[in-house]
Interface confidence: low
């Protein structure tokens, strides 16, 4: 997977009146980096992991930049001329990439309430509009005010593009990010289900990086996709992942069954819990 | 001390009317919008209302329009929710709370609204 | 409206357990998501605010992430006091809505 840093910032407008402040989340490789505290009007950084990417410094430079594209956003919301009553929202993801090729790529997107309307590849400047009339005239509005602002120059899109791959760059300098493996923790858990059964549940949490393979066998031989349910792997907020995957089983088969997992390179397998202890962790 | 206080409820017959009040204090109530969200018994929370900061514009659950009226009275730091035309399934506790429009960090105690025949 | 499913819908567990809760909306709502905490005849608390930014006073071992459609809220290391009912809620756009909630109990 290519390196990415993705900006997530957003503004609300009530009755047409643009809310002041903004949210703000920055994710670096897919996992919550940055956020902006909006009661302490502060880039802050989510978890350990992401305090380690930067050292001991301080985070100006991002409520710097975080304060100004927020800014920016909330004088574009104040420029749509939508319905005007109630709250609304006005969304702006920016992402860049490095490939392993080196090769790079950016690009923008605008949702309102929730809804793409507009999106811009940042290298070549190509703007990619929906096709419902909803989203052509709120793109309209958008593009129409991006084009007065004498900011939002050619100049202004590569820079953009140029800021966004240089702070990916000086994060990826720091080695943390390159070399972080942190292996799952697992645990089985079993629960009644309907007369006979159980249903047996293998969590892997607090995992990084994201790819995994978690999955119940029988006698050493994988279940089928149809008789598992998996559950999404899910950011768990410490800049690791957390993820499941569950089967029903007949009652008093369960040494027959183990969850098998595997992660950068590592793998192993974990039993079914008898029934008087319910729960079995483990690191491997 | 920031504080939000309900009154009003009652227990009263399908089809009948109440009014609720919400009385703010240790905050500047007129810079705040402030909602109405009820609680029936043993079930989940349920937006019901907000109104706007100045009391211009005001909206609505579905469950409760054409039915319930939102109001303040800035003067008085007080916000009301007249509620018309009763049913079974408005029994509820009813909270006011603020967010500006954010999370709701300040909730009234509650007012326990019964509508029974 | 925008829908919030939360899951679990109950959660047996053991004080210092970890304990995840998931929250996901039916379409993007950014970090315009909230989570309360509601013990039974108390008032909502909140927790969480714009999806990650923890509410003054509330302990640190509460945590939330996600943007977009997908939320969780952790608690590293229960405590017997964290027995309650959990409810995310999106202020994105009207009307407001809140998840159905999570009942989290003594296992």
């Known amino acids: 997977e290519p390196h990415s840093l993705r900006y997530n910032l957003t503004v609300l407008s009530w009755d047409g009146s643009v809310q002041s402040g903004f949210l703000a989340e920055v994710h670096l490789d897919g996992q919550p980096f940055l956020r902006y505290d909006r009661q302490k009007c502060r880039a802050k950084p989510q978890g350990q992991w992401a305090e380690d990417v930067l050292g001991n410094k301080t985070w100006d430079r991002e409520t710097r930049d975080l304060t100004g594209n927020g800014k920016d956003l909330r004088m574009t919301l104040a420029h749509i001329k939508d319905q005007k009553e109630g709250l609304h929202s006005l969304q702006e993801i920016r992402v860049c990439e490095i490939h392993e090729d080196n090769s790079t790529r950016s690009s923008q997107h605008f949702y309102y309430d929730g809804e793409l309307f507009l999106s811009q590849n940042l290298e070549t400047e190509e703007w990619t509009v929906p096709q419902s009339s909803r989203a052509q005239t709120l793109a309209m509005n958008v593009r129409n005010f991006l084009k007065e602002d004498a900011m939002k120059t050619k100049t202004h899109y590569h820079a953009m593009h140029a800021d966004c791959l240089q702070e990916l760059r000086r994060y990826l300098e720091s080695g943390v990010v390159l070399r972080r493996t942190v292996p799952p923790m697992v645990n089985v858990t079993r629960s009644e289900a309907s007369e006979g059964n159980i249903t047996v549940t293998c969590r892997a949490s607090s995992f990084y990086p994201r790819n995994i393979i978690l999955t119940w066998r029988q006698d050493g031989v994988s279940l089928s996709h149809d008789t598992q349910q998996w559950g999404d792997v899910l950011p768990d907020g410490n800049g690791t992942y957390q993820t499941w995957v569950a089967t029903r089983i007949c009652r008093g088969e369960e040494q027959r069954f183990t969850c098998y997992m595997e992660h950068s390179g590592n793998h192993s397998t974990h039993p079914v819990p008898s029934g008087k202890v319910l729960v079995l962790q483990s690191h491997w | 001390q920031v504080q939000l206080v309900e009154s009003g409820g009652d227990v009263v017959q399908p089809g009948r009317s109440l009014r609720l009040s919400c009385a703010a204090s240790g905050f500047t109530f007129s810079n705040y919008n402030i909602h109405w969200v009820r609680q029936a018994p043993g079930k989940g929370l349920e937006w019901v209302a907000v109104?706007?900061?100045?009391?211009?514009?005001?909206y609505y659950a579905d469950s409760v329009k054409g039915r319930f009226i939102i109001s303040r009275d800035n003067s008085k730091n007080t916000l009301y929710l007249q509620m018309n035309s009763l049913r079974a399934e408005d029994t509820a506790v009813y909270y006011c709370?603020?967010?500006?429009?954010?999370?709701?960090?300040?909730w009234g105690q509650g007012t326990m609204v019964t509508v029974s025949s | 409206a925008i829908q919030l499913t939360q899951s679990p819908s109950s959660l047996s567990a053991s004080v210092g357990d970890r304990v995840t809760i998931t929250c996901r909306a039916s379409q993007g709502i950014s970090s315009a998501l909230a989570w309360y905490q509601q013990k039974p005849g108390k008032v909502p608390k909140s927790l969480i605010y714009d999806a990650s930014s923890l509410e003054s006073g509330v302990p640190s071992r509460f945590s939330g992430s996600g943007s977009g459609t997908d939320f969780t809220l952790t608690i590293s290391s229960l405590q017997p006091e964290d027995f309650a009912t959990y409810y995310c809620q999106q202020f994105n756009s009207y009307p407001i809505t809140f998840g159905q909630g999570t009942r989290l109990e003594i296992k």
């Open positions: 109104i706007r900061y100045d009391g211009i514009n005001k």
């Open positions: 709370a603020s967010g500006p429009p954010d999370a709701f960090n300040i």
